[in-house]
Interface confidence: low
């Protein structure tokens, strides 16, 4: 556990004036219907708030939305629906908010009937100023910004087109028909399956898949008889068609489409799934549906070409195709990833891993809790952990778990600590370790948000009567103040604080409701004068992450590498400051066998870590054959774990073998490649 | 613009090793494979191996096979083979080759080849006692 | 490994003439084919890719057909600077092979 000096809850001085003479309250001059809300830009704190309120009429439904912008993280906020001549604008494309500082924003707007195309409003000035512009198209789907030229947008018609424009939506050109999803890749470059034969359902697993890296001036097919793709880290995979049944299999390039390799992952029938859990530039998690409605699958971990994988946990939870799957990648430590998994009696359990994948192990009971009802044995179970799945079920659980990676160590999250999940009202966990141990927090459910990075935490209790209390803990949730924000108490909606918790301001959301009307309300609350003064040197400690035997030469390496970080100490009540930035020193660590996976044609022993050659690869074939070449596939049977950066140690080199023999039957024949231009 | 600059002519005596460069610049390196083909004196070329820069990944020919080493420096855009214990047969421009559909793939209609669109100058290795 | 053949090893033709010279694989490389010219003193330059796509800044006289195991390629109307040894170099399995050659000498 990260250290914490004062055991004793001590006050922070004056709060409530403080805070009071920092609370700033703002009522909408709006009916409620519904509210959304982007922050615009990094650090700039301008926000966008859009109302929109239906009437339903006899014939018709009437809608009206009104734009409110803030330029003080929502302090004030000023009506400037006449920018954008008090059109209504479609909330199911919400705002379109461009990359980075770009300062870019785009609004659809909702168009009559019999109009030829659909319109937007755009704004490249941080929504001070807004142009309209009608569109030769009706829209499917919200503006999508190149990654690396907000200038670039792509979007898709109601007809299937595929449409660019080059210059922020000023001008739009449709650079194909019968396009099924698009999606950026690296270098403006822009992957899209398109179909010949009716739709896109009905083509399902014979589409193509296309590139363009010039915004359509020229075309490459990369795929035939596609099912679906997706892109991750710098992978780009696509699940094709077997040639003589109805399974499919992934197939993985790391070039942008050019040359492909099918992943040495099990094929998938109609009725399954693949899905890309997590990805980075070094690997991907891949889940793998079972057979049937079984609710669960496997997780695979790749190596670094994306194309060998290791099982990583069997009876993964993730129910139907783009349905529930608790998988969370906890951003605060290195390598954890938390997920669920459902055991044979149906009962949903959680796991964590603390080295990308490599083991999997329950959560450690925290101490001040006791077992539930769940729990066979009093005093062994563990912490389970409410996410996705637990939401979509509509059990008490008003938000999934909650890391942010300037706030080291830190993870916030609904639980119940036995054998399993349990439906019964939950409470808040916080882990200051990265989730090796957890203590609870908050009493019953909570909507929760980290500011300062880390240095405050604020939470507000979830309950269905109207609230005026927000909690707030100054040393990473072991002691907790509450502030009465309002005399009036509101029908809270929900939390916003800047994306990156950095700031140090809170909006709280609801409604008011008399027996007339009701009315958006937001009360914005600075925390900068309870942090009276910024952070020393002597304001912080130095942690070892992973470090679970202090003994132990090799205490805190995980990947070939161990961090140390300089952490806030509970005891200081400081800013951290906008500009903070997570101090860590890492140092490489000797190389095990636990730092190599095994490469294809080897396999390891249940408790082994060494890498065995298997007997022979007839029931794998050729799909272990890299890149379709059916000759020196050579090994050593070990491969360093993507990520991993040990050296010395054990070198798991030995006499390298020429696998080829073993690739026996004939891939399918490249047949010619299509390219156009336009 | 695109180029391949590879290093200057070698000597070695037979059993010797021999590393040539080749330094890639005017394109982003991890995008295209490269291949080192060799051409002997008055003979046709001969290719000996390809490597993939994102990862190392390499394959070489049968004939090169255990002599042969191809590596890749992703910070300075630069590819190396090395060929180990030289016969006097070795004697011969060694090229490197952008290869930009790299090695054949499983994936029916994805890949249409696009030939080794840019060489480098050649570097002369004599092997002789 | 897949052989490719070439022929006729040497061709005789006279400037604005046309040339026409065969390839030959010992199984299908489908359309994984290429082209490429080489001079004396000089890395080969790539001619066509995919069997019959001009590379970039390749004149129109140059054009390549086949697929399968026969391929052509075509000079028009030779030109001096085209008397060089072409090569034909085959990428549908490894080792990727080449041809042995074909000079165009002056007639």
């Known amino acids: 556990s990260a250290p914490g000096e004062d055991e004793e809850c001590g006050r922070v001085r004056d709060f409530v004036a403080k805070l009071a003479n920092n609370t700033h309250q703002h009522v909408f001059d709006d009916l409620r219907g519904s509210v959304s809300l982007s922050w615009v830009g990094d650090s700039t704190g301008v926000i966008l708030v859009l109302t929109t309120f239906h009437v339903p009429l006899v014939i018709m439904t009437f809608g009206q939305s009104k734009l409110y912008r803030s330029e003080d993280y929502g302090k004030n906020f000023k009506d400037i629906t006449d920018l954008i001549n008090n059109t209504f604008i479609r909330t199911e494309f919400g705002m379109a908010i461009g990359p980075e500082n770009s300062g870019k924003v785009v609004l659809t707007a909702e168009v009559s009937g019999g109009s030829r195309g659909g319109r937007i409003f755009r704004s490249s000035d941080f929504a001070k100023n807004f142009v309209q512009t009608d569109l030769p198209f009706h829209p499917l789907t919200q503006m999508m910004y190149s990654p690396q030229n907000s200038d670039y947008l792509l979007a898709l018609s109601t007809e299937n087109g595929l449409w660019v424009s080059k210059n922020f939506g000023g001008k739009w050109e449709e650079i194909h028909k019968a396009v099924c999803l698009a999606k950026w890749g690296s270098d403006n470059t822009i992957f899209f399956t398109t179909y010949a034969n009716g739709s896109c359902k009905a083509d399902l697993g014979a589409l193509e898949l296309w590139r363009t890296s010039d915004l359509g001036k020229s075309f490459k097919t990369i795929g035939v008889k596609i099912y679906s793709f997706g892109l991750g880290g710098r992978f780009l995979f696509a699940s094709v068609m077997a040639d003589k049944d109805t399974t499919r299999r992934i197939h993985v390039s790391t070039d942008q489409g050019d040359t492909w390799s099918m992943a040495q992952l099990p094929s998938v029938g109609q009725e399954q799934f693949y899905s890309i859990l997590a990805a980075n530039d070094d690997m991907v998690f891949m889940h793998v549906d079972e057979p049937g409605d079984t609710g669960f699958g496997t997780i695979f971990t790749s190596d670094d070409r994306g194309i060998v994988y290791s099982k990583s946990l069997d009876r993964h939870l993730y129910t139907t195709t783009g349905g529930e799957t608790d998988f969370t990648n906890v951003t605060s430590l290195r390598g954890v990833y938390i997920t669920s998994v459902l055991s044979e009696d149906n009962s949903i359990q959680t796991m964590i891993t603390f080295d990308q994948g490599g083991r999997w192990t329950h959560l450690r009971k925290p101490e001040n809790s006791e077992c539930d009802a769940t729990a066979k044995n009093k005093n062994e179970c563990s912490l389970h952990i409410h996410a996705s799945y637990s939401i979509s079920q509509k059990l008490n659980v008003p938000m999934a778990p909650l890391s942010e990676p300037n706030a080291v160590g830190i993870v916030i999250a609904h639980g119940s600590v036995g054998d399993a999940i349990s439906v019964m009202v939950p409470d808040v966990y916080i882990s200051d370790d990265g989730g090796y141990s957890w203590t609870k927090m908050l009493e019953g459910p909570h909507y929760y948000t980290i500011l300062d990075s880390g240095g405050i935490i604020v939470a507000i209790e979830h309950s269905s009567r109207p609230i005026n209390v927000i909690k707030f803990s100054t040393d990473e949730g072991q002691c907790w103040q509450t502030y009465t924000f309002t005399r009036d108490p509101i029908y809270f909606t929900g939390l916003a604080s800047e994306p990156g918790a950095r700031s140090m301001n809170i909006s709280i959301w609801g409604f008011t409701e008399s027996f007339l009307t009701s009315q958006w309300v937001s009360y914005t609350i600075d925390f900068k004068d309870i942090l009276e003064r910024n952070c020393e040197e002597k304001d912080y400690t130095i942690w070892l992450a992973h470090s679970t035997d202090p003994e132990d030469y090799e205490d805190g390496c995980i990947l070939g590498y161990k961090e140390q970080f300089l952490r806030l100490r509970k005891s200081s009540v400081c800013q951290n400051g906008r500009d903070y930035v997570v101090t860590k020193q890492p140092s490489i660590c000797l190389c095990s066998l636990e730092d190599f996976l095994c490469d294809f044609g080897y396999y390891r022993p249940e408790n082994d870590s060494k890498c065995v050659e298997q007997p022979e690869l007839k029931g794998h074939d050729l799909e272990f054959c890299l890149y379709g070449r059916e000759e020196h596939l050579t090994t050593n049977g070990y491969r360093k774990i993507p990520g991993d950066k040990c050296q010395g140690g054990v070198n798991p080199v030995r006499e390298v073998k020429d696998l080829k023999k073993k690739c026996t039957s004939n891939f399918l024949s490249p047949e010619k490649q299509n390219s156009k231009s336009n | 613009q695109v180029r391949l600059v590879q290093s200057g002519a070698e000597v070695r005596k037979p059993g010797a090793s021999v590393k040539v460069s080749c330094k890639a610049s005017g394109y982003t390196f991890t995008k295209y494979y490269m291949s080192w083909v060799r051409q002997a004196p008055g003979q046709g070329l001969e290719w000996m191996g390809i490597i993939n820069p994102i990862g190392g990944s390499t394959s070489y020919a049968q004939k090169f096979q255990g002599r042969v080493t191809m590596t890749r420096d992703t910070s300075t855009s630069t590819v190396y083979m090395e060929l180990s214990s030289l016969r006097s047969e070795d004697t011969a421009v060694y090229y490197c080759?952008?290869?930009?559909?790299?090695?054949?793939?499983?994936?029916?209609?994805?890949?249409?080849?696009?030939?080794?669109?840019?060489w480098g100058q050649g570097t002369t290795v004599t092997v002789s006692s | 490994e897949i052989v490719m053949t070439q022929s006729p090893a040497t061709l005789s033709v006279s400037p604005g003439e046309r040339a026409t010279l065969s390839c030959r694989a010992s199984?299908?490389?489908?359309?994984?084919l290429a082209w490429y010219q080489q001079k004396p003193g000089q890395a080969p330059r790539l001619l066509i890719y995919g069997a019959s796509t001009r590379a970039t800044g390749i004149p129109a006289r140059f054009s390549g057909s086949g697929s399968g195991t026969e391929f052509t390629l075509t000079i028009s109307s030779l030109q001096s600077e085209d008397f060089a040894v072409y090569y034909c170099?085959?990428?549908?399995?490894?080792?990727?092979?080449f041809g042995g050659g074909t000079k165009v000498e002056i007639k």
């Open positions: 080759a952008r290869d930009p559909s790299g090695i054949a793939a499983a994936f029916p209609a994805s890949r249409s080849y696009y030939g080794m669109d840019v």
């Open positions: 170099q085959q990428a549908r399995l490894g080792p990727w092979t």
């Open positions: 199984q299908s490389v489908s359309s994984n």
